[in-house]
């Protein structure tokens, strides 16, 4: 069972008085419609809240929105609707907040049907002031900031024009027509696809991929017969139609599209899809859909070039293009990912990898837990995590799994202890070691959030009834206290805390309902007096990540190195603080064959760690090539796993093979590429 609440186990002294002094209520003088909340900048305390209310009338919709601003993490709000001339803001575009601490905000307004273009409100001072700007186009998408320069914006228009601004939306220029999809790359580069004939839909598979590195002064066509493209880490991917049939294949570039290589991945047909599940500068996880309407596919992991792929996980649950997958990057521990597979019996099971997709296993059954009523064997089962798919299926799961890079090792998720994901009401489980071991944290579904880099975990029960109680833990979810934050319960709609889990403030959002009206209300609770002193060196203890067997000399080695972290002691009730930096010490491990993947033309037979040369593929050439780089087509059969830092130990040396004569590909070659200028 879950740890008791308000038991002696982890009691914080006088917490009720301390929290009561730091609980701030704000009632919003609005009719209840929808509310959206955005944090402006990091550690600024600035929150923007947009409330919108729609009334569908016979011929048109009456809409009203209000804008509120807080600069103290939500304790107090000021109505600033007059700064945007009481204009109705379009919620589907949200609030476009500038990268990092630029202080920039763009709001897109609703304009009447006959107008020449849309209207935006711009702020570059953390929403203290706004400038109204009329656009020469109607936006189709939210304004997109260049990651490198927040003055550079791009947007697509309803007429498929690509528009760019170089002065934070003051002036706009249409740099290209007939654009389907546009994305910022690195160094203020823009990648986009264009259609030649009818429309994006009609030309799917016949699109061109273009690049501009100077905000539209000049262009280069970097791909033809494009179905779609994506960016992940340092990789640019394009799915390209084959010459002979309706299949398509992934091609990859690591030089912004100047040269391409065909990825060693299966081709897909019209009804199938590729999806980049995760990518960093080292490698990529790619999902390849199975033929037919199966709802699953295969995960492949790439080498450092994004070209050679190893099969990582079969029967990976991914319902449809843009549908649901439970694939989750556990950001609190390097190399850990969780996802779901669809078993042969159509049950959904959770799998976890600790080594970036090298091996997947079931989650360990939590200590002192029993398999639920759906399990065939009451003693043999595992923990199955509820994520996006369960939420989409309207199971009683209010939140997806949660982890934070600065709360080392902590993962919180709803789960079932069973043979598979169960329709029974889930409980909340916590892992403090990145997913190796789990403990029931709270009985029944809850909303949860991490504060102060893991120093506090806050939770609210998921209930259809009004609530007035919040739970918190100062020892990584082992012991819980409950605090009644208001006498009058509210209909709870959400928990909000500043992204990054460094804050000590939590906002509880909801509405009150009376006979005639309902109003938005927020309660912001500051936990600073619960953690009344700053943590010192003695409050931390040393922890070895990925430890599974201390008797193994290489215990903790993952991707060629092990890491020791300073972690807050469970019994320390102190503030990590906003400036907390995770202290870690890496040490390099000796290489083993596990640190290498099989290079192109090689594979690992089942239960063998050696890479052996593939048979001649029944007389067929290998569909693979590095354009303009044929001299690199040599291999000894092994390639270090991306991000692996091992040294010494096993060094798989063997005769270097020349792959040139096996090399074929059907993607556009350099002569098909051309440059254009405006």
């Amino acid at each position: 069972s879950a740890p008791g609440e308000d038991e002696e186990c982890g009691r914080v002294r006088d917490f009720v008085a301390k929290l009561a002094n730091n609980t701030h209520q704000h009632v919003f003088d609005d009719l209840r419609g929808s509310v959206s909340l955005s944090w402006v900048g990091d550690s600024t305390g600035v929150i923007l809240v947009l409330t919108t209310f729609h009334v569908p009338l016979v011929i048109m919709t009456f809409g009203q929105s209000k804008l509120y601003r807080s600069e103290d993490y939500g304790k107090n709000f000021k109505d600033i609707t007059d700064l945007i001339n009481n204009t109705f803001i379009r919620t589907e575009f949200g609030m476009a907040i500038g990268p990092e601490n630029s202080g920039k905000v763009v709001l897109t307004a609703e304009v009447s049907g006959g107008s020449r273009g849309g209207r935006i409100f711009r702020s570059s001072d953390f929403a203290k002031n706004f400038v109204q700007t009329d656009l020469p186009f109607h936006p189709l998408t939210q304004m997109m900031y260049s990651p490198q320069n927040s003055d550079y914006l791009l947007a697509l228009s309803t007429e498929n024009g690509l528009w760019v601004s170089k002065n934070f939306g003051g002036k706009w220029e249409e740099i290209h027509k007939a654009v389907c999809l546009a994305k910022w790359g690195s160094d203020n580069t823009i990648f986009f696809t264009t259609y030649a004939n009818g429309s994006c839909k009609a030309d799917l598979g016949a699109l061109e991929l273009w690049r501009t590195s100077d905000l539209g002064k000049s262009f280069k066509t970097i791909g033809v017969k494009i179905y779609s493209f994506g960016l992940g880490g340092r990789f640019l991917f394009a799915s390209v139609m084959a010459d002979k049939d309706t299949t398509r294949r992934i091609h990859v570039s690591t030089d912004q599209g100047d040269t391409w290589s065909m990825a060693q991945l299966p081709s897909v047909g019209q009804e199938q899809f590729y999806s980049i599940l995760a990518a960093n500068d080292d490698m990529v996880f790619m999902h390849v859909d199975e033929p037919g309407d199966t709802g699953f596919g295969t995960i492949f992991t790439s080498d450092d070039r994004g070209i050679v792929y190893s099969k990582s996980l079969d029967r990976h649950l991914y319902t449809t293009t843009g549908g649901e997958t439970d694939f989750t990057n556990v950001t609190s521990l390097r190399g850990v990912y969780i996802t779901s597979v669809l078993s042969e019996d159509n049950s959904i099971q959770t799998m976890i990898t600790f080594d970036q997709g090298g091996r997947w296993t079931h989650l360990r059954k939590p200590e002192n837990s029993e398999c639920d009523a759906t399990a065939k064997n009451k003693n043999e089962c595992s923990l199955h995590i509820h994520a996006s798919y369960s939420i989409s299926q309207k199971l009683n799961v209010p939140m997806a799994p949660l982890s934070e890079p600065n709360a080392v090792g902590i993962v919180i998720a709803h789960g079932s202890v069973a043979d598979a994901i169960s329709v029974m009401v889930p409980d909340v489980y916590i892992s403090d070691d990145g997913g190796y071991s789990w403990t029931k944290m709270l009985e029944g579904p809850h909303y949860y959030t991490i504060l102060d880099s893991g120093g506090i975990i806050v939770a609210i029960e998921h209930s259809s009834r009004p609530i007035n109680v919040i739970k918190f833990s100062t020892d990584e979810g082992q012991c819980w206290q409950t605090y009644t934050f208001t006498r009058d319960p509210i209909y709870f709609t959400g928990l909000a805390s500043e992204p990054g889990a460094r804050s000590m403030n939590i906002s509880i959002w909801g509405f009150t309902e009376s006979f005639l009206t309902s109003q938005w209300v927020s309660y912001t609770i500051d936990f600073k007096d619960i953690l009344e002193r700053n943590c010192e060196e003695k409050d931390y203890t040393i922890w070895l990540a990925h430890s599974t067997d201390p008797e193994d000399y290489e215990d903790g080695c993952i991707l060629g190195y092990k890491e020791q972290f300073l972690r807050l002691r469970k019994s320390s009730v102190c503030q990590n603080g906003r400036d907390y930096v995770v202290t870690k010490q890496p040490s390099i491990c000796l290489c083993s064959l596990e640190d290498f993947l099989c290079d192109f033309g090689y594979y690992r037979p089942e239960n063998d760690s050696k890479c052996v040369e593939q048979p001649e593929l029944k007389g067929h050439d290998l569909e693979f090539c590095l354009y303009g780089r044929e001299e690199h087509l040599t291999t000894n059969g092994y390639r270090k796993i991306p991000g692996d830092k091992c040294q010494g130990g096993v060094n798989p040396v063997r005769e270097v093979k020349d792959l040139k004569k096996k090399c074929t590909s059907n993607f556009l070659s350099p002569e098909k590429q051309n440059s254009k200028s405006n």
């Epitope: 008797e551 020791q564 002691r569 040490s587």
Partner: antibody
Framework: QVQLVQSGAEVKKPGSSVKVSCKAS????????ISWVRQAPGQGLEWMGG????????NYAQKFQGRVTITADESTSTAYMELSSLRSEDTAVYYC?????????????????WGQGTTVTVSS | DIQMTQSPSTLSASVGDRVTITCRAS??????LAWYQQKPGKAPKLLIY???SLESGVPSRFSGSGSGTEFTLTISSLQPDDFATYYC????????FGGGTKVEIK
């Protein structure tokens, strides 16, 4: 079977230093923390500090901070405890002990293997 | 640092008795508590870790319970070999020991 073998008894003058060694055999020394615990005659156990051989991370009890230095030599699987500015009340049996480990936490699971103890007598 | 208070300091019992020793922490230590047995002239021996987990090779008559600040070591039926001094130790970070409980023959 893991064993910890400590250096022999020492007699020291007040104000001097003593360095006690603890050699591990039969296990993976580098993966466990080594703690040093002392016991004055007729008294209870007192933790002085510990070290993790990988990375050499040492931590000390507040009482001994500045007077004790704990080190480890991975190549010889040996841990050392040096106590300086000795006084008569430092007369005790000094034990090294391996911290048991079931997870990545080095200090949470008690001390499962102990050395035989080294008697240090401080007398003028 | 966390203080550990052990009681009683001395306990007289006979073979076959059920013996209970308690240990109180000055603040919550969750389950991070160990129990040791020490005989004169010998090094301590680990009996229990994580408040209630029995170390391998330790007889099952020894058991531990508790969490937070209150912990108990129980010997269900005292054997001749069990007359010794017992120490509790909190294991969360900077380690501290209780003062010890001497179990002697009645």
């Amino acid at each position: 079977q893991v064993q910890l073998v400590q250096s022999g008894a020492e007699v020291k003058k007040p104000g001097s230093s003593v360095k006690v060694s603890c050699k591990a055999s039969g296990g993976t020394f580098r993966n466990y923390a080594i703690s040093w615990v002392r016991q004055a005659p007729g008294q209870g156990l007192e933790w002085m500090g510990g070290i993790i051989p990988i990375g050499g991370w040492a931590n000390y009890a507040q009482k001994f901070q500045g007077r004790v230095t704990i080190t480890a030599d991975e190549s010889t699987s040996t841990a050392y405890m040096e106590l300086s500015s000795l006084r008569s009340e430092d007369t005790a049996v000094y034990y090294c002990a391996r911290q048991g480990r079931k997870t990545g936490y080095y200090y949470y699971y008690g001390m499962d293997v102990w050395g035989q103890g080294t008697t240090v007598t401080v007398s003028s | 640092d966390i203080q550990m208070t052990q009681s009683p300091s001395t306990l007289s019992a006979s073979v076959g008795d059920r013996v209970t020793i308690t240990c109180r922490a000055s603040q919550s230590i969750s389950s991070w508590l160990a129990w040791y047995q020490q005989k004169p002239g010998k090094a301590p021996k680990l009996l229990i870790y994580k408040a209630s987990s029995l170390e391998s090779g330790v007889p099952s008559r020894f058991s531990g319970s508790g969490s937070g600040t209150e912990f108990t070591l129980t010997i269900s039926s005292l054997q001749p070999d069990d007359f010794a001094t017992y120490y509790c130790q909190q294991a969360d970070g900077h380690i501290t020991f209780g003062g010890g409980t001497k179990v002697e023959i009645k």
